[in-house]
């Protein structure tokens, strides 16, 4: 066979679909690899060919488009399953070609099983809701293109195993689920089941997402440095270990990069010659506010080190703050034999 531009196995597109449900899978060539769309390719006389390799097999085989009730079909650049079966799992390839041109890409398709509470190995999208922020909605995802706009599906919403009927603060409204005031107790997995008719058959689409209630932007503040502070003095003798924690609280902010760093005499620790180590730990509250702690450590501190300026800095989308640690050299307790004796005029 003549040469074909092979984009390999596109593992970035790990497609997961539920067993016994319809699935429509677009050929990734037009979305990620080529600079033209299917219509342009088709107009130019290019043909889209599909084939697959079953799970745990090496043999590429054509897809059987002659199954009863057209269970698998192709429409433009979409491969349709009506519905999927567990053994449809495998690597699927779409190839665009004519006599002079060829390009192909493979992608993995995994058909997964769900339990009665919609648990499955499927990776779930996470939707963040702001706590006590007013009405917020989640929308049943990835159902476009399954049925025409003339078809009115029925949509049922569940939290875990249980159907959501109008409840104090969670209200199903067709494709949307409205949270009047989101609370921590609303955290969990929410599932919409979309049921629609097609050619005398009834199909179900199941879509689950995780709702995570997070801190509201109304309550967000610039970073707060809890340590170092004015109440703690790091008093050390030369040769001792100096440990200074920088503990910073960050309000949850969507897509904000939280940063903490130390400067020593105005320079980053990497840019100076002292043997200093920095260890960082991060913890989160239930609403994803973040506390970062960076511990600056100098194993054997020198009297020079104890004269330096140690400043903790923090930055988020809400602002930047800094706080200097109070570091000083401990005055050694007098040794009687020398200092006190001298004080008493002994020679």
């Amino acid at each position: 066979s003549e040469r074909c531009d092979d984009w390999g196995l596109d593992t970035m597109r790990q497609i997961q679909v539920f067993e016994d449900e319809p699935a429509r899978i677009k050929c990734p060539l037009f979305e990620h690899f080529l600079k033209f769309n299917y219509s342009t390719a088709h107009s130019a006389g290019l043909t889209l060919i599909w084939y697959w390799t079953r799970q745990d097999r090496d043999l590429e085989e054509p897809i059987n488009f002659r199954l009863p009730e057209n269970r698998i079909s192709k429409e433009k650049d979409v491969l349709w399953f009506r519905p999927t079966l567990l053994n449809d799992t495998g690597n699927y390839t779409c190839m665009l070609r004519n006599t002079t041109y060829c390009s192909k890409v493979a992608f993995p398709l995994e058909v997964v099983q769900k339990d009665s509470c919609f648990n499955s190995p499927m990776k779930l999208p996470v939707h963040k809701l702001y706590i006590e922020y007013g009405i917020q909605r989640i929308t049943c995802p990835n159902v476009d293109g399954y049925f025409p706009s003339s078809v009115k599906p029925t949509i049922t919403w569940y939290m875990g195993c249980y159907k959501i009927q109008n409840f104090n603060n969670v209200i199903p409204e067709g494709m949307n689920l409205s949270f009047l005031i989101a609370l921590i107790s609303n955290n969990g997995n929410y599932t919409c089941v979309v049921t629609y008719p097609e050619n005398g058959r009834t199909f179900h689409l199941t879509r689950t997402l995780t709702v995570k209630v997070v801190g509201s932007p109304k309550n967000a503040v610039p970073p707060v440095i809890h340590s170092p502070n004015d109440h703690v003095v790091y008093e050390k003798e030369p040769g001792e270990e100096l440990l200074i924690p920088c503990t910073v609280y960050f309000s949850f902010l969507m897509d904000s990069r939280n940063e903490v760093w130390w400067t020593i005499d105005g320079k980053k620790p990497d840019d100076i010659t002292i043997d200093v180590t920095i260890n960082e730990s991060i913890s989160h509250s239930r609403t994803e506010d973040e506390t970062r702690t960076q511990i600056l450590s100098i194993k054997k501190v020198t009297s020079e080190d104890l004269k330096r300026s140690y400043v903790c800095h923090a930055r988020s989308a809400k602002g930047e703050v800094a706080k200097a640690a109070k570091v000083k050299q401990k005055v050694p307790a007098p040794r009687y034999t020398v200092e006190l004796a001298c004080g008493f005029g002994a020679t």
């Epitope: 509470c117 648990n119 249980y162 969670v170 969990g188």
Partner: antibody
Framework: QVQLVQSGAEVKKPGSSVKVSCKAS????????ISWVRQAPGQGLEWMGG????????NYAQKFQGRVTITADESTSTAYMELSSLRSEDTAVYYC????????????WGQGTLVTVSS | EIVLTQSPATLSLSPGERATLSCRAS??????LAWYQQKPGQAPRLLIY???NRATGIPARFSGSGSGTDFTLTISSLEPEDFAVYYC?????????FGQGTKVEIK
């Protein structure tokens, strides 16, 4: 620690109803669901249905549909199971058990309530 | 509804021996299966969920395996307190169903 405490034993006449309660403590009631499972003398376990503590919606086994009603009172952290039109074969120990809203396994169980149906 | 068949009905073993209990489903339940232990006069206790995950506080001698229709609960070395009835339960489809139980008794 989590505890589910059920109401005491009941003796009922055929055709009557029984309502068993299950009070939860040591956890956030609204974060969980409560299922009811029964066990006839010397027999295995039979799942009857369950309820979401937060939404108050229930799932029932087809076998009990129309005869069992499961409710939950979030204010008292208590779930109830009412079984009507009792017959002698309903004589069993009735257990309540807790599970996460999206879990199919029952992680904490009540001590059980013996319901005897006899004329 | 899905029928779970446990075997054997009774298993007679001595302390220290290995116990292997089987649970077969009438159709695939993937890995949506749990195991429980029940002692006389007590409520069941969750041992294993998701076919192979040990519940909190369950000793390492208990292990679960299997997927689809065939599942196994193994007790690597029986302790005196392990003699009880064991039930499997599926949650793949409504209604949730239990096996009829396997009694592990002292030989």
């Amino acid at each position: 620690q989590v505890q589910l405490v059920q109401s005491g034993a009941e003796v009922k006449k055929p055709g009557s109803s029984v309502k068993v309660s299950c009070k939860a403590s040591g956890g956030t009631f609204s974060s969980y669901a409560i299922s009811w499972v029964r066990q006839a003398p010397g027999q295995g376990l039979e799942w009857m249905g369950g309820i979401s503590a937060i939404f108050g919606t229930a799932n029932y086994a087809q076998k009990f549909q129309g005869r069992v009603t499961i409710t939950a009172d979030e204010s008292t952290s208590t779930a109830y199971m009412e079984l009507s039109s009792l017959r002698s074969e309903d004589t069993a120990v009735y257990y309540c058990a807790r599970h996460l809203h999206n879990a199919i396994h029952l992680d904490y169980w009540g001590q059980g309530t013996l319901v005897t149906v006899s004329s | 509804e899905i029928v779970l068949t446990q075997s054997p009905a009774t298993l007679s073993l001595s302390p220290g021996e290995r116990a292997t209990l089987s649970c077969r489903a009438s159709q695939s339940v993937s890995n949506f299966l749990a195991w429980y232990q029940q002692k006389p006069g007590q409520a069941p206790r969750l041992l294993i969920y998701g076919a192979s995950n040990r519940a909190t506080g369950i000793p390492a001698r208990f292990s679960g395996s299997g997927s689809g229709t065939d599942f196994t609960l193994t007790i690597s070395s029986l302790e005196p307190e392990d003699f009880a009835v064991y039930y499997c339960q599926q949650g793949k489809h409504w209604p949730w169903t239990f096996g009829q139980g396997t009694k592990v008794e002292i030989k």
